[in-house]
């Protein structure tokens, strides 16, 4: 129903805690250079705003729109222009024209320095003088690096922080129990943070039909005793939320995602068996549970696919009347037999499908013309199956950092144009996908590896959109959504690229690469190696092999030697030298 | 390859009216034809469409007062109670091969004229 | 229903100008169901444009179709004379009973 005040009626919904929260990560994915002090400011003049609001409906302003309240906000920080440059603009138009523009606007790799970890003693000492101000120290730093995260699942990452903080704080060895704690925390955020950008990329590329068909998919796959009209609901209310949150409309977003919450647990017996557990959880917790909760068990009896989608003699009719509710339906039915496919699959089979519909139902004698449809299926279900065996092969035989590197080399042969730090930082987190997926059960191998290389994958894409240097990468990226992942891996060495000439500095090294952390020594070398790469194309594995030992084995003797820089200076040249001959 | 309709006239208003779109060089039993409409000085109005199968689809507008048939090598669009509104040259045009529901014709005939005038 | 709302028309151009026309689509067209049509007084439709950007085979690479969803555009570069007529979007959509036509752009080459 309408509201009076959308403001008053949000912060009443949300309470101010949360409402504090979502308005600093609103204002700091919007407007990503400014300092923390800076947003607090202004979170705090709507927040004192909106009471005014919940105090009096009618006081001036209060029926303002969300947009236009806080896009005045915005718009009335001194030097703008300044600091945003043509970011500026968008305060001369009026909503919604203004709010779209801010939305262009975000910056998917602003050039901000990584988020550094505080050591121990010093986060315990201010969490502890004031857990307000650290928490939002942690929002309004993952938010401005990460303009799309879904808002809600930051204040659930943001109250796992306070927890662990809470708890480890309090014992001796402070550093020993955060680092664990707080990696694992980070590493799940980082997932949510593609896996929710690969979402308002769904959402803005191809439309809420494109977003709420995966959503059918997926909740189909997690609730295969659902009926179709409540997957359909349930998909409906899903795309509702997510449309919200990728549009920056985070606090609407977040009071519809509890409300979905709600509704799921007060629905169980219509939903799922396992949803228990999670809806005993306090809101955010409910919520992020209800996410990923485990997958029902499938009806025992289950008819035939061919049924309805290949023998019905009105197939062609259903089709044409109802391609969406034909399609979901079917879409719906495939998903919930098979759990073990991935959510991009499903979406090609369908495809295949309503493709084979729409050639076969013009002519004399569709049956006979799409009677071999789920025969056809087969190449596409073995096409991932295979990527997932070869690729869990091979992380299991070279572990992560193995795996990382022969991706690494794969990707820099498909896509040399690509920057260096692009190609590295893609390849490690593909690289991930072993560690993260490989050692599950065979049945959940598939739908791990291929949804998770997706978003990835859609990360490449955003950074090579914002400069197109590869051909190769243009045409996968701008194909549909679910054929990015087979097309990327389709590709082979580009041949049109004329290799980098050997330059001396690239490969040059000094001592202070000893000191540095693990992932750093590893982020160093993997540069080296697409360098290589980017020098020598075609190089064989082998030669690759070679030369990276001899790398590893020089930074082995000379971080160990006495006199490092010594050490690097007059073996590094000897190094290059032996690189060149060895790649000639 | 071509298409060519027949039938149009001038009928009073009431009068049904069935007109004909015949084709050569075309097996009708490989393609979708459908029939579009057009009023003097204004814009095509899709009416409806058969399938080589003989499955028939009508604009939500049209359903009711119009039929189209295959009776042989010819499809035929049958027209009842027509008005003063339904004066228009129609044109019978075949879907591109390959799509069944695309709005994709890619050969049109020369169209008919119907003026339904009392 | 559907509907599909062309803007502007009429619209001119001189020769060797460009022609940017748009359709609007309510609600989403199916799967880029979308085409363009050319017609000439006296003459039927001719399709340019299916898929949304997809030219049909012996239509000048001149014409460009564009859009998704809901925003539709064709671009007519570097026109000429024979480019004077009016043109049509054609959209399909959910059901086959929905295909429907824009209202149609008289293009004027002066």
């Known amino acids: 129903e309408a509201h009076k005040s959308e403001i008053a009626h949000r912060y009443n919904d949300l309470g101010e805690q949360h409402f504090k929260g979502l308005v600093l990560i609103a204002f700091s994915q919007y407007l990503q250079k400014c300092s923390y002090d800076e947003h607090a400011k202004l979170v705090q003049e709507v927040t004192d705003f909106a009471k005014t609001c919940v105090a009096d409906e009618s006081a001036a302003n209060c029926d303002k729109s969300l947009h236009t309240l806080f896009g005045d906000k915005l718009c009335a920080i001194p030097n703008l222009r300044e600091n945003y440059g043509e970011l500026a603009d968008c305060c001369t138009k009026q909503e919604p024209e203004r709010n779209e523009c801010f939305l262009q606007h975000k910056d998917d790799n602003p050039s901000l320095p990584p988020f550094e970890r505080p050591e121990a003693e010093a986060m315990c000492t201010s969490f502890k003088e004031n857990p307000t101000t650290f928490m939002g120290h942690y929002l309004h730093e993952v938010a401005r690096r990460h303009p799309y995260f879904y808002a809600p699942e930051l204040l659930y990452y943001a109250e796992q922080y306070n927890e662990i903080l809470t708890q480890c704080c309090a014992e001796a060895d402070k550093e020993s129990c955060l680092t664990p704690k707080l990696d694992g925390v980070k590493e799940k955020a980082l997932v949510s943070s593609v896996r929710q950008r690969m979402k308002c990329s769904s959402m803005q590329k191809f439309g809420e039909r494109a977003f709420k068909a995966w959503a059918v998919a997926r909740l189909s796959q997690t609730f295969p005793n659902a009926d179709f009209a409540e997957i359909t609901k349930l998909a409906t209310d899903l795309t509702k939320v997510n449309k919200e949150c990728c549009h920056g409309d985070l606090l609407e977003c977040a009071d519809d995602r509890a409300e979905l919450a709600k509704y799921m647990c007060e629905n169980q017996a219509t939903i799922s068996s396992k949803l228990q557990t999670c809806c005993d959880k306090p809101l955010l917790k409910k919520a992020h549970c209800l996410s990923e909760v485990e997958h029902d068990t499938m009806p025992a009896d289950l008819p035939a696919i061919a049924a309805d989608f290949v023998e019905d003699q009105e197939v062609c009719k259903n089709y044409a009347e109802a391609k969406d509710v034909f399609l979901g339906t079917f879409l719906y039915e495939y998903s919930r037999r098979h759990p073990d496919y991935s959510v991009s699959l499903l979406l090609r089979l369908a495809k295949k499908y309503e493709a084979t519909l729409e050639k076969c139902c013009a002519e004399a004698n569709p049956p006979a013309c799409y009677g071999t449809v789920l025969a056809e299926f087969q190449p596409l279900v073995e096409e991932p199956k295979n990527l997932v065996k070869t690729n869990c092969d091979l992380y299991e035989k070279l572990g992560e950092y193995g795996f990382q590197n022969a991706i690494l080399v794969r990707y820099t042969q498909k896509a040399p144009q690509v920057s260096t730090p692009t190609l590295v930082e893609a390849a490690r987190n593909l690289g991930r996908v072993g560690t993260k997926c490989c050692t599950l059960p065979e049945d959940q191998r598939l739908p791990c590896v291929e949804d998770y290389l997706s978003a990835i994958l859609n990360r490449v894409c955003l950074l090579h959109e914002k400069t197109p240097v590869s051909e190769h990468v243009t045409k996968c990226c701008s194909g549909s959504l679910v054929e990015r992942r087979p097309c990327f891996s389709a590709l082979t060495v580009d041949e049109t690229y004329v290799p980098k000439e050997f330059k001396a500095e690239t490969f040059t090294f000094h001592s202070d690469i000893c000191t540095l952390p693990e992932k750093e020594k590893q982020i160093k070398k993997q540069t080296a190696l697409a360098e290589l790469v980017k020098h020598k194309p075609k190089a064989t594995a082998e030669q690759l092999k070679t030369v990276m030992d001899d790398f590893a084995q020089f930074l082995d003797t000379c971080c160990k030697a006495a006199d490092k820089d010594t050490c690097f200076s007059t073996e590094g040249p000897n190094l290059v030298t032996r690189c060149k001959d060895a790649l000639a | 390859q071509s298409l060519e309709e027949s039938g149009g006239r001038l009928v009073t208003p009431g009068t049904p009216l069935t007109l004909t779109c015949t084709v050569s060089?075309?097996?009708?039993?490989?393609?979708?034809i459908n029939w579009v409409r057009q009023a003097p000085g204004k814009g095509l109005e899709w009416i409806g469409i058969i399938w080589a199968s003989g499955t028939t689809f009508y604009a939500t507008w049209a359903k009711g007062r119009f039929t189209i048939s295959r009776p042989s090598t010819t499809v035929d669009l049958e027209m009842t109670s027509l008005t003063t509104a339904d004066t228009a040259t129609y044109f019978c045009?075949?879907?591109?091969?390959?799509?069944?529901?695309?709005?994709?014709?890619?050969?049109w005939g020369p169209g008919t004229l119907v003026t339904v005038s009392s | 229903a559907a509907v599909l709302t062309q803007t502007p028309s009429p619209v001119s151009a001189a020769v060797g100008g460009t022609v940017t026309i748009n359709c609007q689509s309510s609600?989403?067209?199916?799967?880029?169901?979308l085409s363009w049509y050319q017609q000439k007084p006296g003459q039927p439709p001719k399709l340019l444009i299916y898929e949304a950007s997809k030219l049909t085979s012996g239509v000048p690479s001149r014409f460009k179709g564009s859009g998704s969803g809901t925003q539709f555009t064709l671009t007519i570069s570097d026109v000429q004379c024979g480019d004077a007529a009016t043109y049509y979007c054609?959209?399909?959509?959910?059901?086959?009973?929905?295909?429907?036509f824009g209202g149609g752009t008289k293009v004027v080459v002066k």
């Open positions: 609600p989403s067209v199916w799967s880029n169901f």
């Open positions: 060089g075309i097996d009708l039993s490989n393609y979708a």
């Open positions: 045009a075949r879907t591109v091969p390959g799509y069944s529901t695309a709005p994709y014709f890619d050969l």
């Open positions: 054609g959209g399909g959509y959910s059901s086959i009973s929905d295909t429907t």
